[in-house]
């Protein structure tokens, strides 16, 4: 594929990445799939500056990011190392709370109304943010 040089329509560029901010809600897995179909991934927050950028655009609304622990340890969807990476959890989070009565714990991370992170039930229909890197090759076939 060819290397993407600018962001698609309705996506916002920041520091060589493109971001798309949903205005509706989906379960985490559906949001994850939506981004993949757009040749992107749920947003992976790697710095305080990126956190501030995303937070400014989503406002005080619960919003999924590309971080989960559905298979045990916390993992970013693009393979970015969780342990050494940026974190912005709310105090006492993540807590894998079972008291919600929906079965199981809390395996998916989201931005809360103040921007800090919380783990929650992955089935909740929250907004989401997709991200794709400008410097990566797109999956679209080259124009003939």
């Amino acid at each position: 594929g060819s290397e993407r040089t600018c962001c698609p329509v309705n996506w916002v560029e920041h520091e060589r990445s493109c971001y798309w901010f949903s205005r509706s809600g989906k379960a985490w897995a559906d949001a994850d799939n939506y981004c993949r179909l757009e040749d992107a991934h749920l947003v992976v927050v790697t710095s305080w500056e990126e956190q501030k950028f995303v937070q400014h655009h989503i406002g005080p609304v619960n919003t999924w990011m590309g971080l989960h622990d559905q298979n045990g340890p916390w993992k970013w969807v693009d393979g970015t190392d969780y342990e050494t990476g940026f974190k912005n959890w709310r105090p006492e989070q993540p807590d894998d709370w079972y008291g919600h009565g929906l079965g199981g714990g809390e395996d998916c991370a989201h931005f809360t109304d103040d921007g800090r992170w919380n783990d929650d039930v992955c089935q909740r229909p929250y907004r989401w943010v997709c991200e794709t890197e400008l410097d990566k090759a797109s999956q679209e076939p080259p124009l003939l």
Partner: antibody, heavy 121, light 107 residues
Framework: QVQLVQSGAEVKKPGASVKVSCKAS????????MHWVRQAPGQGLEWMGW????????NYAQTFQGRVTMTRDTSISTVYMELSRLRSDDTAVYYC??????????????WGQGTLVTVSS | DIQMTQSPSSLSASVGDRVSITCRAS??????LAWFQQKPGKAPKSLIF???SLQSGVPSKFSGSGSGTDFTLTISSLQPEDFATYYC?????????FGPGTKVDIK
């Protein structure tokens, strides 16, 4: 012009608490996080945490977790840093510094003048 | 936590000299590095942010470079008012951390 004016020097006994204020003027208060940084005599700089002026969210360095509380009063454009259970090694100059909510912009561009907190029995 | 180291820890230089200070992060921090100047009894003053962007009002004799783990602050022609301690700071990840400082004094 932008100013961050901090409260005056304090002398406290071990085990006591201290509350330092930082009054902002010359800019939109809610447009900037406020960080607190301290510097022990003759030592380097140590980041303590931040407070979001709009929603009051905080993030504290692990070192200070459980001892520090940052609050704000938007009506008077002032943030506060309270440190409890003071020890002699908390003797330091405490600074506030602002950091823009919206990027890209320069973080830590303005600092308060500093508040010396002395902990001594 | 990300450790920041600076070298040298101190240096003696003359007015007019070109001076460079290096800062190294224990892991990659992209370009999220700032440089500060501090004089005795004063608050730190911001010189450089985002590794190479000059803070508003700071003279162009100060410049910064680097990305990832290795960064440099350069003063192209040292003036009497530049004798101070210089700190680097990473603001990529919490907790934000500072280097131990480099003291620049008169030879």
């Amino acid at each position: 012009q932008v100013q961050l004016v901090q409260s005056g020097a304090e002398v406290k006994k071990p085990g006591a608490s201290v509350k330092v204020s930082c009054k902002a003027s010359g800019y939109t208060f809610t447009g900037y996080y406020m960080h607190w940084v301290r510097q022990a005599p003759g030592q380097g700089l140590e980041w303590m945490g931040w407070i979001h002026p709009n929603n009051g969210g905080t993030n504290y360095a692990q070192t200070f977790q459980g001892r520090v509380t940052m609050t704000r009063d938007t009506s008077i454009s002032t943030v506060y840093m309270e440190l409890s259970r003071l020890r002699s090694d908390d003797t330091a100059v405490y600074y506030c510094a602002r950091d823009p909510v919206v990027v890209p912009a320069a973080p830590f561009d303005y600092w308060g003048q500093g508040t010396l907190v002395t902990v001594s029995s | 936590d990300i450790q920041m180291t600076q070298s040298p820890s101190s240096l003696s230089a003359s007015v007019g000299d070109r001076v460079s200070i290096t800062c190294r992060a224990s892991q990659g921090i992209s370009k999220y590095l700032a440089w500060f100047q501090q004089k005795p009894g004063k608050a730190p003053k911001s010189l450089i942010f985002a590794a190479s962007s000059l803070q508003s009002g700071v003279p162009s004799k100060f410049s910064g470079s680097g990305s990832g783990t290795d960064f440099t602050l350069t003063i192209s022609s040292l003036q009497p008012e530049d004798f101070a301690t210089y700190y680097c700071q990473q603001y990529n990840s919490f907790p934000f951390t500072f280097g131990p400082g480099t003291k620049v004094d008169i030879k």
